[in-house]
């Protein structure tokens, strides 16, 4: 089974703990590690911000201790913008330009290949996102030819089923992706108005949320049934929670919030706590688990979390497993407790650990 | 092998103007950004320009900001610093460095730039 | 812009000896700070890169440590050919800035 970890770049900045380099990254843990993000400028792959290439360094040296190891680099993410990443697509000069200039970069800063993440595609890009995907796949073999091992080309999907229907034709990206990280998470947030899980297995009876798509089984058997081969298919697994600040005494699933939870010491962003922070939040907290959706929640005061453990992760190792799939994606790496500190198991990584251990298990 | 070969240093009055070129070898050129960064005789080392590896970013220190110009030619492997309103102060020693993430990690061997009159 | 301040700006010292040179950033550069050596007449050389990752080819009597505001280079054992002026450098924003240098000297 593959194990994509995804690593950000922007996690080196968060202040005393919460500071990660890609060095501090266990070499053996994962089958993939991809870097976000990298920036497109001029038509060209480059560096988001200048130290990057330190970072690509850093973590492209943990392959020399494993040559096993995969390095991918993903280029795009939220602060890119659909809006640059549709420019460059739909405009064949622009695109023949981005795409000559990738394998070059790649090689030159040691990854063995790309990751796209158009976050995401509109209505009228499904269809140059595809030509993007298939030129960028035709370049990469034509790269190879020289006797070089090929680049891998994946893509980082919406697991919302509006964004599926309207993004991707996924029966033909599926044919010239290596594979595909579906991004089962954030389900749920805060302008749905009530408490949620973000990340949920299976529906559930409690499941509050107005539509049926919103879970983890869903998407993936959406995507199955859309034409992605289960053996290309990644099941994204958060090491991250998303948190309300309750408004009234209730703390079931559905209670109302007043908006999002209060930002994480490190993260420092409202609504979002990593793993590490939950352990912190979860001391003198009133754990739950949602039976049907097969994952915990958390509150203390006025403030509700749903996030993965231990236990949940395993659930959703069992789940990809029995519907064959190629394996587990985790967002993030620098989310979870990378330092071994804050969650009292003496264990750096314990949840892409225990994703691991569950993947590896007969 | 890395290699950095800087030219076109030499005396100028000032006022006057001088364009540094850097060919450099052994590495895709294309694919990094580069820096200049100089030295004054008996002094220590000052980052002067940068630009990223398709020119769509550049810095300058603001000592020389609105007089000189950083550019690049991948296609020629080589990258210029294009010196205007020369001063006294601009006299040093131009090195040209491949960059690793705002970290210099290989030089030219420099080229030397004397403003005088 | 950020500082840098060395010390001490020269010592005099014997093969054999360790030595430790400091670099004080003005405020908080996490850990990007390099170390570089410089010989007369020649350019400069990276030794040091983010605070502690030792370059490919320097030999490992060099090392660095530290994160935030205070770096330490030290030689473990000096040897004839490590005379020279060794400067940090802070890559953590532009202005990119060097420390003034330090000069390590046969006594």
């Known amino acids: 089974y593959k194990l994509v970890c995804y690593y950000t770049s922007w996690s080196q900045y968060r202040e005393g703990d919460g500071s990660c380099f890609p060095d501090a990254l266990d070499r053996f843990l994962c089958t993939h590690i991809i870097y976000s993000f990298a920036n497109i400028s001029n038509d060209h792959i480059d560096t988001w911000e200048w130290n990057d290439v330190t970072l690509y360094g850093m973590l492209n040296t943990l392959k020399n201790r494993n040559p096993n190891l995969k390095t991918l680099l993903s280029v795009g993410g939220w602060n890119f913008g659909s809006q640059r990443f549709s420019k460059i697509a739909s405009n064949t000069q622009s695109r023949r330009t981005f795409i000559k200039s990738v394998p070059p970069f790649l090689r030159t800063h040691g990854f063995d290949g790309l990751d796209l993440a158009w976050l995401y595609p509109g209505r009228r890009d499904k269809q140059h996102f595809t030509t993007l995907i298939k030129e960028m796949k035709a370049e990469f073999i034509k790269e190879a030819q020289p006797g070089k091992k090929q680049l891998l080309l994946s893509a980082a999907l919406s697991a919302g089923k509006v964004t599926i229907d309207s993004s991707y034709d996924i029966a033909k990206i599926s044919q010239h992706l290596d594979f595909i990280s579906i991004m089962t998470y954030d389900f749920h947030g805060a302008w749905r108005g009530t408490t949620g899980h973000h990340s949920p297995l299976f529906r559930g009876q409690e499941d509050a949320s107005p539509d049926r798509f919103s879970n983890t089984d869903y998407a993936v058997g959406y995507m199955l049934r859309l034409g992605a081969p289960a053996s290309k298919l990644v099941m994204g697994i958060p090491t991250f929670g998303r948190s309300f600040t309750l408004a009234s005494s209730e703390t079931g699933v559905g209670a109302p919030i007043s908006g999002p939870g209060i930002p994480g010491r490190f993260t420092k962003e409202a609504g979002t706590l990593a793993y590490y922070e939950i352990c912190d939040f979860l001391r003198g907290a009133t754990v739950h688990r949602i039976l049907g959706q097969q994952v915990p929640y958390a509150t203390k005061g006025n403030q509700w979390v749903g996030y993965d453990d231990q236990e949940s992760v395993k659930s959703k190792v069992q789940y990809l497993k029995d519907r064959q799939l190629a394996g587990a994606m985790v967002w993030a790496l620098d989310l979870d407790d990378f330092q071994g500190s804050f969650c009292g198991q003496d264990l750096r990584f314990p949840l892409t650990n225990a994703i691991k251990d569950a993947l590896a298990a007969t | 092998e890395v290699q950095l070969v800087e030219s076109g240093g030499g005396l100028v009055q000032p006022g006057g103007s001088l364009r540094l070129s850097c060919a450099a070898s052994?590495?895709?050129?294309?694919?990094?950004?580069m820096h200049w960064v100089r030295q004054a005789p008996g002094k220590g080392l000052e980052w002067v320009s940068a630009?990223?590896?398709?020119?769509?970013?550049?810095y300058y220190a603001d000592s020389v900001k609105g007089r000189f110009t950083i550019s690049r030619d991948n296609s020629k492997n080589t990258l210029y610093l294009q010196m205007n309103s020369l001063r006294a102060e601009d006299t040093a020693v131009y090195y040209c460095a491949k960059d690793f993430g705002a970290v210099f990690d290989y030089w030219g061997q420099g080229t030397l730039v004397t403003v005088s009159s | 812009d950020i500082q840098m301040t060395q010390s001490p700006s020269s010592l005099s010292a014997s093969v054999g000896d360790r030595v430790t040179i400091t670099c004080r950033a003005s405020?908080?550069?996490?850990?990007?700070l390099n170390w570089y050596q410089q010989k007369p007449g020649k350019a400069p050389k990276l030794l040091i890169y983010a605070a502690s990752s030792l370059q490919s080819g320097v030999p490992s009597r060099f090392s660095g440590s530290g994160s935030g505001t205070d770096f330490t280079l030290t030689i473990s054992s000096l040897q004839p050919e490590d005379f020279a002026t060794y400067y940090c450098q802070q890559s953590s924003s532009t202005p990119w800035t060097f420390g003034q240098g330090t000069k390590v000297e046969i006594k």
């Open positions: 405020q908080s550069i996490s850990r990007y």
């Open positions: 630009i990223s590896s398709s020119s769509g970013t550049i």
């Open positions: 052994g590495f895709t050129f294309s694919s990094y950004a």
